[in-house]
Interface confidence: low
């Protein structure tokens, strides 16, 4: 074992180093002292440390540790924060484009249905946005509301344009008929399936990214225990008390200390791994009806086809609805 | 035939000079995020080692500090922590995670459960053809230029695949920089059933 170097006779080196940590020299002894009051840097002989210095070292060690932890997670944190923002905005853009496509489809193919159609389409896509952001809305209700609102306008403007302007009573009858007679065939159900599945996955994807940020933030701002502070102080600063300013901690010793300090944090590891692998599984499944980009951008076309389905069946529907909503229609004509 | 406005498409003249190579889809961006996240899969288990490697540790020196004294770097004493009679390292480990860490672990467990549920193939109706449930999927009308994907996956996409990430105010990797790209050259005013199936795996 190498002999310990002679202690600094004047504690000068320790003083100049400590001054950087804590301006003002009143805590540093002029010359080495017995240090019987020390609790962490237990001396083997005379020491250049005081109890107050020890406390300052502990505080600094914990701060250092927190900074190291923050710098360790900086790249990961930025990756998730940036992507969460990118995806959230990208999803908003998808919704905006989908709304524009749907409005353009109405404007160019069914001008007589606008501006009412614009209003219903706008409400639908507002609900879509809110749902993605976590709002407690039922997707099936959203789709039903869209078709319930559209059908009275389609009936009165396209199928039966001779009718006077819609009044509330026939509208209510037509809304009921829409479901009873499966006026749009299976299109609403098709859209419900696609929209609910794709939005569910999108919503969970965003929730997962935001939780990722929360996980990093939590571990980023952990306050380390006093025990950990003492261990870190022994490792990083106690050598200074002996005037060993240039010496560094042993690698294996550092690992032991860090594992002790980070025992709680490391417990996250299992769930973090699972989180990334589960997120990967989800992402691998985000295609076809599980891809909101794919689904929402195709909606205008599906809605167009659903209206054409109604038009193809207009003869039969007009007759049936004529009987079903006759009472409402008679009142309208009066 | 259904008329679709030119404003839904990229201008045909622009198509000639479009930078097809910079097309970026949400799907590819998601996959890239996962690839990058996977490089952090050992983040928490590697933290102690990471912090040691980013704080002063004796690497080339002959002597190092073991918490009590100066020792030779490769001696047995180098790994000892010299904490006799002070506080027990094992005890420190046994204390268990702080409440805030336990809380975040619970949240992770919950989201992992949700993610797994959403990813489970048996929880999906990918293969259940909606035609069985009354969807009349017959041929498209004679005068129509597009068809619906009846089983819920053949969605139509407008010609100009959206380049969302180009519209975002974030500086992404140069490699990811999206630009104008074309899906196909539109013939007349048709809407094509051609769409992004690049993420169907």
């Amino acid at each position: 074992q190498p002999p310990p170097p002679p202690p600094d006779a004047t504690c000068h080196q320790v003083r100049s180093f400590f001054q950087r940590l804590q301006p003002g020299l009143k805590w540093v002894p002029e010359t080495p002292v017995p240090g019987s009051d020390l609790q962490v840097c237990l001396p083997k002989g005379p020491t250049c440390c005081s109890r107050k210095m020890e406390e300052k070292y502990q505080l600094t060690a914990r701060l250092n540790m927190e900074q190291l932890l923050q710098s360790a997670s900086m790249e990961l944190k930025f990756l998730i924060i940036q992507n969460a923002a990118v995806f959230q905005e990208a999803f908003e853009i998808v919704v905006r484009h989908a709304k524009n496509y749907t409005n353009a489809m109405f404007k160019n193919n069914y001008p007589s249905l606008t501006p009412q159609a614009f209003e219903f389409v706008g409400e639908f896509f507002t609900d879509v946005s809110l749902y993605i952001l976590g709002s407690d809305i039922n997707v099936d209700d959203m789709v039903n509301e869209l078709f319930d609102s559209l059908f009275p306008v389609i009936y009165t403007q396209l199928m039966n344009p001779g009718l006077p302007d819609s009044a509330l009573d026939i509208n209510e009858c037509l809304r009921g008929a829409r479901r009873d007679l499966k006026v749009f065939g299976n299109f609403p159900k098709l859209i419900m399936t696609q929209v609910s599945k794709s939005l569910q996955v999108t919503r969970i994807f965003l929730q997962a990214l935001n939780l990722g940020i929360e996980v990093i933030n939590t571990t980023d701002h952990l306050k380390f225990s006093k025990d950990c502070g003492r261990m870190l102080t022994r490792m990083w600063y106690c050598s200074y008390c002996q005037g060993l300013m240039m010496v560094k901690p042993c690698g294996g010793y550092c690992n032991v200390v860090m594992q002790g300090c980070m025992a709680g944090v490391v417990e996250i590891d299992k769930y973090w791994r699972e989180y990334i692998l589960s997120l990967e599984e989800l992402v691998n499944g985000m295609y076809r009806i599980y891809d909101m980009e794919n689904v929402l951008l195709g909606l205008f076309s599906t809605i167009h086809d659903s209206i054409q389905y109604v038009q193809k069946n207009a003869g039969k529907l007009t007759t049936t609805i004529g009987k079903l909503c006759a009472h409402s229609q008679q009142r309208q004509y009066r | 035939s259904a008329y679709y406005p030119e404003d839904l498409f990229i201008d045909k003249k622009v198509l000639k000079v479009a930078h097809v190579e910079h097309e970026e889809t949400l799907s590819s961006r998601r996959r890239e995020l996962i690839q990058k996240l996977k490089s952090f899969i050992s983040f928490y288990s590697a933290l102690p080692g990471y912090i040691c490697s980013h704080s002063p540790v004796a690497e080339n020196d002959t002597l190092c500090w073991n918490g009590q004294e100066l020792v030779e770097r490769y001696s047995q004493k180098a790994a000892r922590n010299g904490m006799k009679n002070q506080f027990n390292l094992h005890e420190l480990k046994m204390k268990g995670p702080e409440p805030v860490v336990s809380q975040i672990i619970d949240k992770l467990k919950h989201i992992n459960q949700l993610l797994r549920t959403m990813s489970m193939p048996k929880g999906r109706v990918l293969d259940k053809n909606l035609d069985e449930e009354g969807f009349e999927s017959g041929d498209c009308g004679d005068d129509e230029d597009e068809c619906i994907g009846g089983s819920g996956d053949g969605m139509i996409k407008v010609k100009n695949q959206l380049r969302f990430l180009a519209e975002l105010a974030y500086d992404l990797d140069v490699d990811d920089a999206p630009g104008n790209s074309q899906q196909a050259t539109p013939k007349d005013n048709e809407i094509s059933t051609f769409h992004n199936l690049g993420n169907v795996h």
Partner: antibody, heavy 119, light 107 residues
Framework: QVQLQQSGTDLARPGASVKLSCKAS????????ISWVKQRTGQGLEWIGE????????YYNEKFTGKATLTADKSSSTAYMELRSLTSEDSAVYFC????????????WGQGTALTVSS | DIQMTQSPASLSASVGETVTITCRAS??????LTWYQQKQGKSPQLLVY???TLAEGVPSRFSGSGSGTQFSLKINSLQPEDFGTYYC?????????FGTGTKLDLK
């Protein structure tokens, strides 16, 4: 202009492995998937799988899982297909093909690599 | 997987004639169908996608039609360069599968 240049004719022994290459030029390699297609003499075409060069993610036709391994090198804009445990059934012409946009429509094809497996 | 069946398997015709090749899908693929032409010893070339959209540079004598499960490729006024093998392929999802092929040769 877009080109896919494939490696030349290959002769391999049964049980061996072989790696075919497909060098892309004329477009940004990372923006489109590259598919591999098998054609046995006088027979039809079979899709093996595709690689997304940007992330290097491969996707396989179940039939070829375990037989083919698809990789891509972004720096050289080259896609590779490794075929292992070769048998005479693997003797065929193998084409690489570029995705048209983002779907399984192939607008540009390589000239093909003829592979003969024989002892 | 979706099976694609072409008919006829082979066909002889003369220059100037009109021919029609058909392709049947084992399930509804809507309009997700592509046609390719392949000449002996060469790689396939894209002719038509989405059942009826002509690829860039393809002569207008070629036309595609159909949707659902029945599709056809019609070639008006055959030219010498049109002889070869024609394949249909669905692009409805993974795995894309190709038809059995129709060999068109000179009568």
């Amino acid at each position: 202009q877009v080109q896919l240049q494939q490696s030349g004719t290959d002769l391999a022994r049964p049980g061996a492995s072989v790696k075919l290459s497909c060098k892309a030029s004329g477009y940004t390699f990372t923006s489109f998937g590259i598919s591999w297609v098998k054609q046995r003499t006088g027979q039809g075409l079979e899709w093996i799988g595709e690689i997304y060069p940007r992330s290097g993610s491969p996707y396989y036709n179940e039939k070829f899982t375990g037989k083919a391994t698809l990789t891509a090198d972004k720096s050289s804009s080259t896609a590779y297909m490794e075929l292992r445990s070769l048998t005479s059934e693997d003797s065929a012409v193998y084409f690489c093909a570029k995705d048209f946009g983002s779907s399984y429509v192939f607008d540009y094809w390589g000239q093909g690599t003829a592979l003969t497996v024989s002892s | 997987d979706i099976q694609m069946t072409q008919s006829p398997a082979s066909l002889s015709a003369s220059v100037g004639e009109t021919v029609t090749i058909t392709c049947r899908a084992s399930e509804n693929i809507y309009s997700y169908l592509t046609w390719y032409q392949q000449k002996q010893g060469k790689s396939p070339q894209l002719l038509v996608y989405n059942a009826k959209t002509l690829a860039e540079g393809v002569p207008s004598r070629f036309s595609g039609s159909g949707s659902g499960t029945q599709f056809s490729l019609k070639i008006n006024s055959l030219q010498p360069e049109d002889f070869g093998t024609y394949y249909c392929q669905h692009h409805y999802g993974t795995p894309p599968t190709f038809g059995t092929g129709t060999k068109l040769d000179l009568k």
